[in-house]
């Protein structure tokens, strides 16, 4: 978790002098509770936006937006703590809006936004906005949270972001798998424009079952430049096991930008349709 373009963070708006600060996610009001605390944020919204760094890289960011309730507690609102927790790693990053002037009611509802938390493809985050100071131990909570799931690199808009392109999202291998005679599979796919090796991982399963009955790995050496974007054809020999008929073919590239952590593509061959077994015809026809 990190912030995009850290030095350009702004939270001031007409009628409010405000500064964005790093936060330890443990505001002082936890340790020294106040008697009077503001109410919770209203209408928390999270959107996925895309932002360029000064280097020209494109990153997905969480755009966080919320409004204030129209009650007198804004007189005691000193700021807000924005927290993003990545659920699979438990990593948390916080920033604090520090109000340098008192808020006053005005003709339209106060609205705040922040769009600098960089998020990763296919990750889930808990986004929380806490008004400050935080409530006394048994006080009503004054925060709002939402769990936000970022699309993965298969998503059309994510595909062109820097983290996705680094993991090989622009490569479309267009895999075809064909069943041949004599227990063989022909796998064909389009090579990318990089001199790097590939691995084909074959996993076979029985019909309607999910435990594998055969596994095989096939190494494909790095292509020469004249072979870039060409089709690579590989014939794999299967184990002669009756009913081991559903095959998943996965192609793992080893691009320089992602090494052994590149996006994999796969294709599946289903078991052949079994024809309905007809009634056996007797060898002879009885005459009576």
């Amino acid at each position: 978790l990190r912030l995009l373009d850290h030095r350009a963070l702004v939270c001031s708006q007409p009628g409010l002098n405000c500064t964005v600060k790093n936060s330890t996610c443990l505001d002082d009001s936890w340790i020294h509770p106040r008697n009077l605390t503001p109410s919770s944020p209203k209408d928390l919204q999270i959107q996925l936006h895309f932002a360029h760094t000064q280097q020209g890289d494109l990153f997905p960011v969480a755009h966080i937006e919320w409004t204030l309730q129209t009650d007198a507690s804004i007189l005691y609102l000193e700021g807000a703590e924005l927290s993003v927790l990545q659920l699979n790693t438990n990593e948390r990053l916080c920033v604090r809006f520090e109000f340098l002037s008192k808020l006053r009611h005005h003709h339209r509802r106060w609205r705040f936004t922040f769009s600098h938390f960089v998020v990763d493809p296919d990750q889930e985050y808990e986004v929380t906005v806490h008004h400050l100071p935080k409530p006394i131990p048994d006080g009503d909570p004054n925060h709002q949270s939402k769990n936000f799931l970022v699309p993965d690199c298969e998503h059309a808009r994510m595909k062109v972001t820097t983290p996705c392109m680094s993991s090989g999202s622009l490569w479309d291998p267009n895999i075809t798998v064909e069943t041949l005679e004599a227990h063989q599979l022909r796998v064909s796919f389009t090579l990318w424009n990089e001199s790097t090796h590939y691995q084909i991982l074959l996993t076979s399963f029985p019909h309607m079952e999910n435990h594998s009955c055969f596994e095989h790995m096939h190494h494909i050496p790095a292509p020469r430049p004249e072979e870039f974007h060409q089709r690579s054809n590989v014939t794999l020999t299967l184990r002669n096991l009756k009913g081991c008929c559903r095959h998943q073919v996965q192609i793992q590239p080893f691009f320089s930008s992602c090494l052994n952590d590149c996006l994999r593509h796969s294709a599946t061959v289903s078991c052949p349709e079994m024809p309905d077994t007809p009634e056996p015809i007797p060898d002879y026809m009885p005459l009576w």
């Epitope: 919204q45 999270i46 959107q47 996925l48 755009h63 937006e65 939402k146 769990n147 936000f148 799931l149 970022v150 699309p151 993965d152 298969e154 998503h155 059309a156 808009r157």
Partner: nanobody, 126 residues
Framework: QVQLVESGGGLVQPGRSLRLSCAAS????????MHWVRQAPGKGLEWVSG????????DYADSVKGRFSISRDNAKNSLYLQMNSLRPEDTALYYC???????????????????WGQGTMVTVSS
């Protein structure tokens, strides 16, 4: 033009099933999370279920968990709600709604809904 059209509602007995469909047009359907929202007679809107752009994540309101099943077919620009074991309290106008922004939030919308259908009425009564 941009629109969502629901179908499949009707009168059904308690315990029976119904399948709602929602046909989308005018926007890139497979970019966005989609949701079902209902409104019982004389009540407010209640979020029922949501599904992410690629069906990878799905969530349900506690009141329908285990009985309703949401799905989508991006090739057909369609959203579905399979409703089993229907109860009288499921009687409502069911709306299909598009998430305003990219991404998916558990327990409802991330950023509000910007396209709604006209709704299809489901009445559960003996």
């Amino acid at each position: 033009q941009v629109q969502l059209v629901e179908s499949g509602g009707g009168l059904v007995q308690p315990g029976r099933s119904l399948r709602l469909s929602c046909a989308a047009s005018g926007f890139t359907f497979d970019d966005y999370a989609m949701h079902w929202v209902r409104q019982a007679p004389g009540k407010g809107l209640e979020w029922v279920s949501g599904i992410s752009w690629n069906s990878g994540s799905i969530d349900y309101a506690d009141s329908v968990k285990g009985r309703f099943s949401i799905s989508r077919d991006n090739a057909k620009n369609s959203l579905y709600l399979q409703m089993n074991s229907l109860r009288p309290e499921d009687t409502a106008l069911y709306y299909c709604a598009k998430e305003k922004s990219l991404g998916f939030c558990r327990g409802g919308s991330c950023s509000g809904f910007d396209i709604w259908g006209q709704g299809t009425m489901v009445t559960v009564s003996s």
